[in-house]
């Protein structure tokens, strides 16, 4: 099972800690940056840099802030209302079907193909057949010559929930 829980997974959220700011829930919900107390009568603030909540919620604890892995850069820090935003380092990308790690971008396209898309933090370089213009599935054939290219510059941050 995944060790990650996001507020999308849980929907609302929260956790109690001593000497934290308290306010009353509104219609049973606490605002972003808070969680509900065990008795449901107070909203308790999340701890900056440690945990967070992004939505109005009735969760009993705040979600843990993501720590960026090695091979990732931190685009923005965790606040009480937003998780850390991590992005793959230049020259690497994160695929949707294996979001747990950054993979190295290919350095070029197989013979007979041309590069039409750069390496970004969320996608490998994109190659198409010279004649047909159809996209290449991804993996580089083992002994093919490749056309080298430099990694592209990230266009926008790739948000990681965690």
């Amino acid at each position: 099972e995944s060790a990650l829980i996001t507020q999308q997974d849980l929907a609302p959220q929260q956790r109690a800690a001593p000497q934290q700011k308290r306010s009353s829930p509104s219609e049973g919900l606490c605002p972003p940056g808070h969680h509900i107390s065990e008795d449901g009568r107070d909203c308790i603030s999340c701890k900056y840099g440690q945990d967070y909540s992004t939505h109005w919620n009735d969760l009993l604890f705040c979600l843990r802030c993501t720590r960026c892995d090695s091979g990732e850069v931190e685009l923005s820090p965790c606040t009480t209302t937003r998780n850390t935003v991590c992005q793959c380092e230049e020259g690497t990308f994160r695929e949707e079907d294996s979001p747990e790690m950054c993979r190295k971008c290919r350095t070029g396209c197989p013979r007979g193909m041309v590069k039409v898309g750069d390496c970004t933090p969320w996608s490998d370089i994109e190659c198409v057949h010279k004649e047909s213009g159809t996209k290449h599935s991804g993996e580089v054939p083992a002994v093919e010559e490749t056309v080298t290219s430099s990694p592209g510059t990230p266009a926008s941050p790739c948000s990681l929930s965690g």
């Epitope: 099972e1 995944s2 060790a3 829980i5 997974d9 849980l10 929907a11 609302p12 959220q13 956790r15 109690a16 009353s24 829930p25 219609e27 049973g28 509900i36 065990e38 008795d39 449901g40 009568r41 945990d51 919620n57 009735d58 969760l59 009993l60 604890f61 843990r64």
Partner: antibody, heavy 122, light 112 residues
């Protein structure tokens, strides 16, 4: 199918400790609280406390603080309750049961283990 | 702690006939969020409790519609419209409005 399977019956001497296990399957273990209940012979149920496998927080019924210690092993999706300094009044069937992480739906238990009888006798 | 009481403590029933169990709490179970956290469980002989009704009147998935819950404040009722042989066991009410959560003493339902 959600299942909570508890360890077998135990017989302990007064003053000893016992650790009861509850192995969860059929759902994401870190997505729900694990609660523990006590049912003394011929008696009603008492809520002991709950463990949050996501952040490892515990929340106890004041009556059982110092008596029960709740832990989990996330790698095996197993929850544990250790009872210390056992006395005859700790003789009971102990149940694990899961509940939701939200206040509005967190106060009832949708799935229960089969129960573990702990007998304290000299 | 909130004390939950149930009546009767023993209820002999005839299959096909209705049955009713009362549950009272020592304080109102209406939370400040306006919801009422009163639940019902059935513990069949030799089994663990199973959730029947949550938050006064909501049937848990798979629970037959012959079971219904009602009530407010401190007085609550579980009704079985037509008792079946498989309904025997001990029925518990439980509250989670106030910490610690507490259970009633149980009502033992048995066939006459």
């Amino acid at each position: 199918e959600v299942q909570l399977v508890q360890s077998g019956a135990e017989v302990k001497k007064p003053g000893a400790s016992v650790k009861v296990s509850c192995k969860a399957s059929g759902y994401s273990f870190i997505g729900y609280f694990m609660n523990w209940m006590k049912q003394s012979p011929g008696m009603s149920l008492e809520w002991i406390g709950r463990f949050n496998p996501y952040n490892e927080d515990t929340f106890y019924n004041q009556k059982f603080k110092g008596k029960a210690t709740l832990t989990v092993d996330k790698s095996t999706s197993t929850a544990y309750m250790e009872l210390s300094s056992l006395r005859s009044e700790d003789t009971a069937v102990y149940f694990c049961a899961r509940s939701a992480y939200y206040f509005d739906s967190g106060g009832y238990f949708d799935y229960w283990g089969q129960g573990t009888l702990v007998t304290v006798s000299s | 702690d909130i004390v939950m009481t149930q009546s009767p403590l023993s209820l002999p029933v005839t299959p096909g006939e209705p049955a009713s169990i009362s549950c009272r709490s020592s304080q109102s179970l209406v939370h400040s969020n306006k919801n009422t956290y009163l639940h019902w469980y059935l513990q069949k002989p030799g089994q663990s409790p199973q959730l029947l009704i949550y938050k006064v009147s909501n049937r848990f998935s798979g629970v037959p519609d012959r079971f219904s819950g009602s009530g407010s404040g401190t007085d609550f009722t579980l009704k079985i419209s037509r008792v079946e042989a498989e309904d025997v066991g001990v029925y518990y009410c439980s509250q989670s409005t106030h910490v610690p959560w507490t259970f009633g003493p149980g009502t033992k339902v048995e066939i006459k």
